[in-house]
Interface confidence: low
């Protein structure tokens, strides 16, 4: 027979030879980190047809690490569903909790004993410090000193001392996020007042008022014989300026050689009209990062060598 088979869990006792006589027997022993459980055989014999009798290393079992319980408010997930050495234990906290300690423990062989690479982590409740105070405004739950995950506060502006009110710029409600940080910056309270928009040779068709505060919206149309240069809709922005700028009504000059076109009350040229959405200074959509289970990047929760969950 040729050299006997090799196995993952057991090794040949003695050195292999290039040739074996029929009837010759070889014995195996469990490798370091594996232990023998009877009754399966760990030897084989060179058969008369020059092949080794069937043998397997099923009798040699991997050393296993001690059982780990789920952390309070979390889970201990054995990668590949096993506690055997060479594998890992992954720790995941429930929503609203974060991990203190190692996210992955490794089942390692120390001598012939399998032990975990460290102490199991714990899952702590996500807490936020009070949100920022703002000038000329206040938020709900101002007396609370510690906020829990997803706790929300809502800001409002104080009554203004003068004739013009404070406007709330930004989102009024913020919440305690999963990484102990408030979901967005606090809003601000300030007086926002835009000048009365005057359009010569045109008129206001909506948004009438004597005073124009934050987010006030006004629409215009030009008189007959005039066309709109700019946007027909403007909004009072947080800098007390109109966005887009107040439009102009310009006179329609009839072409010299052709008959002038029939005019409606307002003629808008698409090349000069800017919609509020496309305005360069218009409001930007805010990006809220996706909720994850751990600040920044975790170590690979799924784990190295983790083919099966």
């Amino acid at each position: 027979c040729e050299e006997p088979p090799t196995f993952e869990a057991m090794e040949l006792i003695g050195k292999p030879k290039p040739y074996y006589e029929i009837g010759e027997r070889v014995d195996y022993k469990c490798k370091k980190g594996y232990f023998y459980i009877p009754p399966l055989a760990t030897h084989t014999i060179c058969d008369r047809n020059h092949t080794w009798l069937p043998v397997s290393d099923d009798a040699c079992y991997r050393e296993t690490c001690p059982y780990i319980r789920d952390p309070l408010n979390g889970q201990a997930v054995p990668a590949n569903g096993t506690y055997e050495f060479g594998y890992q234990m992954h720790f995941i906290c429930n929503e609203g909790y974060y991990l203190i300690g190692e996210e992955i423990l490794y089942c390692e062989l120390k001598g012939s004993v399998a032990i975990w690479s460290g102490k199991p982590p714990i899952c702590e409740k996500v807490l936020c410090t009070p949100p920022p105070k703002i000038k000329n405004g206040k938020h709900t739950f101002s007396e609370v000193e510690v906020f829990e995950y997803l706790d929300a506060v809502t800001y409002s502006c104080d009554p203004a001392p003068g004739p013009d009110p404070f406007s709330l710029i930004g989102e009024s409600t913020i919440y305690c996020g999963d990484n102990s940080v408030w979901s967005r910056a606090a809003p601000e309270c300030k007086v926002v007042k835009c000048r009365f928009p005057v359009v010569e040779n045109g008129k206001q068709i909506s948004g009438f008022g004597k005073k124009f505060y934050y987010k006030a919206t006004v629409m215009f149309e030009c008189d007959k014989g005039f066309y709109l240069d700019g946007s027909d809709t403007i909004v009072c922005d947080s800098n007390s300026t109109w966005d887009p700028p107040v439009p102009k009504c310009l006179k329609v000059l009839p072409p010299s050689s052709t008959k002038p076109p029939a005019l409606s009350h307002s003629v808008s040229t698409s090349s000069t009209t800017k919609s509020p959405a496309s305005s360069a200074s218009g409001p930007r959509p805010t990006y809220k990062p996706p909720v994850s289970n751990y600040p920044g990047y975790p170590k690979p929760e799924e784990g190295i060598l983790d083919s099966l969950d």
């Epitope: 995941i92 490794y106 289970n293 990047y297 975790p298 170590k299 690979p300 929760e301 799924e302 190295i304 060598l305 983790d306 083919s307 099966l308 969950d309």
Partner: antibody, heavy 116, light 107 residues
Framework: QVQLQQSGGGVVQPGRSLRLSCAAS????????MHWVRQAPGKGLEWVAF????????YYADSVKGRFTISRDNSKNTLYLQMNSLRAEDTAVYYC?????????WGQGTLVTVSS | DIQMTQSPSFLSASVGDRVTITCRAS??????LAWYQQKPGKAPKLLIY???TLQSGVPSSFSGSGSGTEFTLTISSLQPEDFATYYC?????????FGGGTKVDIK
């Protein structure tokens, strides 16, 4: 044998969206975590995204976070990459890869070109 | 993020040569390292995982060694089909990162 068949690449304008698919066969798809990796023309490999076998955990590279979404349908043995707000720098060959003994099986790759 | 630095980035060799490529991690990654081979227009192919374990079906002329921050891929006798680009990759923590690659071409 293990096979990962990719589709969905093409030419797209900046700011637009595209969805890549990776159809798996020859193994129990629902037991394996999966990844997307990309390679810009003439450049090295860059890991893009990861999804756990049951879809419960996903991780992304900083360069795609908030724009790309990895997902899977275990009943259809298919992995997806939804790419929104595409940029010129997203131009690359995209590969899906199985997380077995590390990245032991790869798709054939699909080219995504972002150009106006 | 863990940076993976591969050297050299370019290597000229002849058939039968012994070739060594090194990969250095910016922080310890134990043995969580893989080596891949990529040929033009093809997907990468896994050669070595867990720093030194040969993937099934890969010729024994390929071997890997190292642990912690220093790793080596060795081709004991370069064959014509081995001319390709080689990448190392760490799987110790997210984001997963690859080395910049080593192109092995014919001298």
């Amino acid at each position: 044998q293990v096979q990962l068949q990719q589709s969905g690449g093409g030419v797209v304008q900046p700011g637009r969206s595209l969805r890549l698919s990776c159809a798996a066969s020859g193994f129990t798809f629902s037991s394996y975590a999966m990844h997307w990796v990309r390679q810009a023309p003439g450049k090295g490999l860059e890991w893009v995204a990861f999804i756990r076998s049951d879809g419960s955990k996903k991780y992304y590279a900083d360069s795609v976070k908030g724009r790309f979404t990895i997902s899977r349908d275990n009943s259809k043995n298919t992995l997806y990459l939804q790419m929104n707000s595409l940029r010129a720098e997203d131009t690359a060959v995209y590969y899906c890869a199985r997380h077995g003994n590390y990245f032991d099986s790869w798709g054939q790759g699909t080219l995504v070109t972002v150009s106006s | 993020d863990i940076q993976m630095t591969q050297s050299p980035s370019f290597l000229s060799a002849s058939v039968g040569d012994r070739v060594t490529i090194t990969c250095r991690a910016s922080q310890g990654i134990s043995s969580y390292l893989a080596w891949y081979q990529q040929k033009p227009g093809k997907a990468p192919k896994l050669l070595i995982y867990a720093a030194s374990t040969l993937q099934s079906g890969v010729p024994s002329s390929f071997s890997g060694s190292g642990s912690g921050t220093e790793f080596t891929l060795t081709i004991s006798s370069l064959q014509p089909e081995d001319f390709a680009t080689y990448y190392c990759q760490q799987l110790a923590s997210y984001p997963l990162t690859f080395g910049g690659g080593t192109k092995v071409d014919i001298k």
